[in-house]
């Protein structure tokens, strides 16, 4: 006789939501085997007994964690099979904070993952990369760990933040740095990464200060597991700290990008402006608080931003975009400091 | 010169609480982290808590969790530690030191301050 | 937590001695590390940062080593005034830890 489990292995790891079917057969020269499981908490139906064998469906919810047998008998001989179950949940679902880095500061950077199980430290670790070497001379700060607010009741999800002061970036400061998260688990290894990209001085290696008026480019690479391309910012940069500085310009690197141009005179107006030749139309697609509020004029290759009631412009990120080719050009505005021009 | 100058220790009875202060010169206050560090009579260096210069950050031992909070006030350069519930195995000299930038090692330290629970 | 384990915990040496004295990490710190010098009754004082980079004003005769989990500092000819004791303390991660000490004796 011979008796078998299918999937063989002694520890599998389920993905939260998914189903999976062990299968227990046992084959008998004398008559039909008797087969099923025993040592798990199984809702009515998830267990398909047959003659000979047994099937035990998972269906990738926490209860489903545990360690069942599969017995099988056979006349006088009896055999036994344990699986150690665990269900996981590790979506690609990684915020890091500041949305950029600025070099030349003192900063702290931050990266969390939601909604994870198991929120256990040694089965989730985090890394902040450089390339794909660890950052040297990082100073990781403690861990956090949080319950993940569920809209029903049921699993208990949990996010986990990693954060670590950064050193010095160095001159010339790299294009990006990376927060990968592992999740070790049984014969198996997840991993996620996100991408921080640095601020770039397109004239000079030091760091930016609040006189200063050379714009500074956000630059970006590209990898498989990033979810941002780098070159739009789409958000907000969330809350301070972002650094206090005259108006800065963050800008996709192209042959041909729109201008943003601040008129004092005409009451805190942004002009945005594209000179890439005709057919070419821009609009402003980001301003702090809801573009909406805002007194927007557009005209073809022009496009004016202006506070309604009139008054000094919000401090926060603004953005234009260029059509066709849908190049963006991103000024930050601290408030109340002298105004440039964006290059 | 840059100085960091401790002070407010004393005896305390178990359960009472104490404030430390830490007057700081010679330096922007404002651009550092800073830390209290102590040592049990005999004993090794023990660390306790941070505070980033903004103050946006801090973080305790386990061993005071929930009984010290650590505080600034940057116009006045000085740094605080509230000690509550204070039990025997608090007492030791309380140090405050200034964190490098970038580095993160402890380079300037005060004098120190006694801290003795007993009743 | 990082544990930090010194070794030896106390040693007697002659002024003139060559002093070495280890430090093991429970894990990599890479380079995190740094070294301090206590005498009885004072603050501690940096020694050394970054494992090896020696902090200004320090006699040239104190040397650290090492990178990952096994570091060193060396006096190289222990003086009078060197009579103290020891600390490492890893600042990789929260919360940063301290060997227990070294306590380097007159012989």
């Known amino acids: 006789q011979s008796f078998q489990v299918n999937p063989p292995e002694s520890e599998v790891a389920v993905a939260m939501g998914t189903s999976l079917q062990i299968t227990c057969s046992m084959s008998c020269d004398e008559g039909v085997a008797r087969v099923h499981w025993r040592g798990l908490d199984t809702s009515l139906g998830s267990v398909q007994t047959l003659p000979g064998s047994s099937i035990l469906s998972v269906r990738g919810m926490l209860s489903d964690t545990g360690t069942p047998v599969c017995v099988g008998s056979c006349g006088s001989r009896s055999f036994q099979h344990s699986v150690k179950i665990l269900v996981y949940a590790f979506p690609d679902q990684l915020v890091v904070s500041p949305e950029f880095l600025v070099p030349g500061q003192d900063q702290v950077v931050s990266c969390t993952a939601h909604n994870i199980w198991p929120a256990d430290p040694n089965s989730l670790s985090f890394a902040l990369l450089l390339g794909e070497q660890r950052l040297e001379g990082a100073q990781a700060l403690e861990p956090e760990q949080e319950e993940e607010i569920q809209e029903a009741e049921g699993t208990p999800l949990f996010r986990m933040t990693q954060r670590w002061r950064l050193p010095s970036l160095g001159t010339p400061a790299p294009p990006a740095l990376h927060c990968q998260v592992t999740m070790q688990l049984p014969k198996l290894v997840l991993t996620h990464r996100k991408e921080i990209p640095v601020l770039q001085s397109q004239t000079s290696p030091k760091p930016p200060n609040t006189t200063s008026a050379e714009p500074y480019i956000l630059t970006s690479s590209s990898t498989a597991e990033a979810v941002s391309t780098g070159l739009n910012i789409t958000t907000l940069p969330s809350a301070p700290p972002y650094p206090k500085l005259s108006p800065r310009t963050l800008s996709s690197e192209g042959p041909c990008r729109p201008k943003i141009h601040q008129d004092l005179e005409a009451g805190w107006e942004l002009l945005c402006e594209a000179s890439c030749g005709p057919g070419v139309t821009v609009r402003w697609t980001l301003a702090p608080g809801d573009l909406a509020t805002y007194h927007k004029r557009e005209a073809g290759a022009q496009a004016w931003l202006s506070v309604l009631p009139p008054g000094p412009m919000v401090e926060g990120w603004f953005q234009c975009r260029q059509d066709p080719g849908g190049e963006v050009t991103n000024l930050y505005v601290p408030g109340q400091v002298t105004p440039n021009s964006s290059s | 010169e840059v100085q960091l100058l401790e002070s407010g220790g004393g005896l305390v009875q178990p359960g009472g609480s104490l404030r430390l202060s830490c007057a700081a010169s010679?330096?922007?206050?404002?651009?550092?982290?800073m830390h209290w560090v102590r040592q049990a009579p005999g004993k090794g260096l023990e660390w306790i808590s941070y505070?980033?210069?903004?103050?946006?950050?801090?973080n305790y031992a386990d061993s005071v969790k929930g009984r010290f909070t650590i505080s600034r006030d940057n116009s006045k350069n000085t740094l605080y530690l509230q000690m509550n519930s204070l039990r025997a195995e608090d007492t030791a000299v309380y140090y405050c030191?200034?964190?490098?930038?970038?580095?993160?090692?402890?380079?300037?330290w005060g004098k120190g301050t006694t801290v003795t629970v007993s009743s | 937590d990082i544990q930090m384990t010194q070794s030896p915990s106390s040693l007697s040496a002659s002024v003139g001695d060559r002093v070495t004295i280890t430090c093991r990490a429970s894990?990599?710190?890479?380079?995190?590390l740094a070294w301090y010098q206590q005498k009885p009754g004072k603050a501690p004082k940096l020694l050394i940062y970054a494992a090896s980079s020696l902090q200004s004003g320090v006699p040239s005769r104190f040397s650290g080593s090492g990178s990952g989990t096994d570091f060193t500092l060396t006096i190289s000819s222990l003086q009078p005034e060197d009579f103290a004791t020891y600390y490492c303390q890893q600042y990789k991660s929260y919360p940063v830890t301290f060997g227990q000490g070294t306590k380097v004796e007159i012989k």
């Open positions: 894990q990599s710190i890479s380079r995190s």
């Open positions: 505070i980033s210069g903004d103050s946006g950050y801090t």
């Open positions: 030191a200034r964190d490098r930038p970038y580095y993160y090692y402890m380079d300037v």
């Open positions: 010679g330096f922007t206050f404002s651009d550092f982290w």
